[in-house]
């Protein structure tokens, strides 16, 4: 070890270790933790804080309204009473909850953070973790459902309502567990030397775990969609040799590609910056992660606003139901799809099956 200074030969540079015995700081102020992490704790509202809060509240109002609309649409239209749509409704519920969690955050951020206790700070972060985990888990469940559907050559999975409920319960259980983990112990309240910078009451190790967990989920989704895409391309190539409709196959391929790119692209754009930032917080001491934190959190939250658009709004049947709800119209034919309705435009299983199983497209 290098000498600390030339002025004294006795004392060389320290090797800093953790505190000798475990000390817990449950009764400490939030300022105590922020002061030790080097994270700025505002005392008054500045332009950036106001901008973030204003934009945040606007986004969460949109998130809640858009996702509420999706849930109502799936509930009122019997054509949507299938596993894929139940999962989409659950995704909307998760995103609605994300809106609520973010709303709570918005009123407990900036200078208001100082008023929080250790438990209310953990609640604030736990709500966000729970809602975002539920959103991601739902996206994964939808990807798995579509994968099963395509490979079993069905328009809809033969999954019973009971099984769908089980899947939904598993999603929310997982989300609640993930959100509660820091509150029940995986935090740095009793390990002050290992607090993170971005979340001063969370352990470095939890941030790494959280980031990797979500990135792995993302990779699994990419693999699932790549597998679906490869399978469909293989089948459409084979079919185009035996049928007179290569144009139809190409259009289906383009529609599929478009949807997959939008789904995965939105996820990458919204989530990757924040997750990478969490890893940099721990792995890159010289990186100023705190400067981008608020905007990347906002970007991750945008994913909850985009999901209703990506999964629902591109679906013609869904947008028609939206119009009926918003204009207070009665649904004329709630029992089945209209012969010409192009639900394949956004719903990936429909897109695939329209080209691959061209005889099945009217079966619901």
């Amino acid at each position: 070890m290098a000498a600390a200074s030339t002025s004294s030969p006795v004392i060389s540079q320290p090797q800093f270790t953790a505190m000798n015995e475990q000390q817990c700081f449950y009764n400490e102020s939030i300022a105590f933790f922020y002061n030790r992490s080097g994270k700025y704790l505002a005392t008054e509202w500045n332009t950036v804080s106001k901008l973030v809060m204003g934009l945040g509240i606007t986004v969460c109002v949109f998130i809640m309204l858009a996702n509420l609309l999706v849930m109502v649409a799936i509930y009122v239209n019997r054509r949507f009473h299938f596993p894929i749509y139940y999962l989409m409704a659950n995704l909307a519920a998760a995103d609605f909850f994300a809106g609520l969690a973010y709303f709570y955050l918005m009123f407990n951020t900036g200078p208001n953070t100082r008023r929080l206790t250790v438990s209310t700070w953990l609640l604030r972060q736990g709500l966000i973790d729970t809602s975002l985990t539920a959103s991601v888990a739902n996206l994964l469940a939808i990807a798995i459902e579509r994968h099963i559907t395509v490979f079993r050559m069905q328009l809809h999975t033969r999954m019973s309502n009971r099984r769908v409920v089980v899947v939904i319960v598993v999603i929310w259980t997982m989300a609640i567990v993930m959100g509660a983990i820091p509150s029940v112990g995986w935090n740095c309240i009793c390990d002050i030397d290992h607090c993170s910078n971005m979340a001063p009451l969370y352990s470095d190790s939890y941030l790494v775990f959280w980031a990797i967990f979500n990135l792995v989920t993302f990779v699994v989704m990419v693999v699932l969609y790549a597998h679906i895409f490869g399978y469909v391309r293989q089948r459409t190539m084979r079919m185009s040799r035996h049928s007179s409709g290569p144009r139809r196959n190409r259009d289906t391929m383009m529609s599929l590609l478009k949807t997959v790119v939008i789904v995965l692209g939105a996820f990458i754009v919204c989530w990757t910056p924040g997750l990478v930032l969490l890893l940099l917080d721990v792995c890159c001491p010289q990186c100023d992660v705190l400067a981008y934190e608020k905007f990347f959190l906002l970007l991750a939250e945008f994913n909850s606003a985009m999901n209703p658009i990506i999964y629902s709004y591109r679906d013609k049947e869904m947008s028609a139901t939206f119009r009926q709800i918003l204009c207070c119209q009665r649904n004329e034919n709630p029992n089945g799809p209209t012969e010409g309705s192009d639900r394949s435009a956004s719903s990936l299983n429909h897109t695939i099956l329209a080209g691959v199983h061209s005889n099945d497209h009217s079966v619901v």
Partner: antibody
Framework: QVQLQQSGAELARPGASVKLSCKAS????????ISWVKQRTGQGLEWIGE????????YYNEKFKGKATLTADKSSSTAYMELRSLTSEDSAVYFC???????????????WGTGTTVTVSS | DIHMTQSPASLSASVGETVTITCRAS??????LAWYQQKQGKSPHLVVY???TLTEGVPSRFSGSGSGTHFSLKINSLQPEDFGIYYC?????????FGAGTKLELK
Amino acid sequence: QVQLQQSGAELARPGASVKLSCKASGYTFTSYGISWVKQRTGQGLEWIGEIYPRSGNTYYNEKFKGKATLTADKSSSTAYMELRSLTSEDSAVYFCARESISRRLGWNFDVWGTGTTVTVSS
Amino acid sequence: DIHMTQSPASLSASVGETVTITCRASENIYSFLAWYQQKQGKSPHLVVYNAKTLTEGVPSRFSGSGSGTHFSLKINSLQPEDFGIYYCQHHYGPPLTFGAGTKLELK
């Protein structure tokens, strides 16, 4: 070798301003906070404030708010302290000191500069 | 602000003796206490942090103890290089405050 090299002695008139520098070497500058400490002749140590170069955050002793301004230049790995509206009370040795732990603030200091003597006299 | 009270203000001792310097905080600072040694015309040097953890390179004859509001620094078998002024400092969080110092002199 980890070192904090401070600028030379300053002689200033009352009411003037001085800017002291503290150049860090031998470690990643942005990973550690830098504090400034005042010591009047024959007296104890008084903490002025700290800058955390990683984020640019500054922490001040209320007593020195308006008197001292802390800045850091990441490109030259140098921390600065500007003292304004100088009076005889500001005549002292000013030390810069490095945080003992990286990536967070432990509020104790393992590496100290050699000190800069500021003399305020008319 | 947290006020640090050090005692005694000065202390005379001979080489080989054992001395104890105490420091009291005006409020609970857990184990967030550091001890510094400063020699005439030199910069302070960190001896102990977290109340009892010795900085690397500091001889084992130095030992820190205490938590909450009462702390002490004990030096066994004093050596010539141990003389100087010792300051305690809380590192609970800003604003940081130091004790007035204890001058350890050779008898």
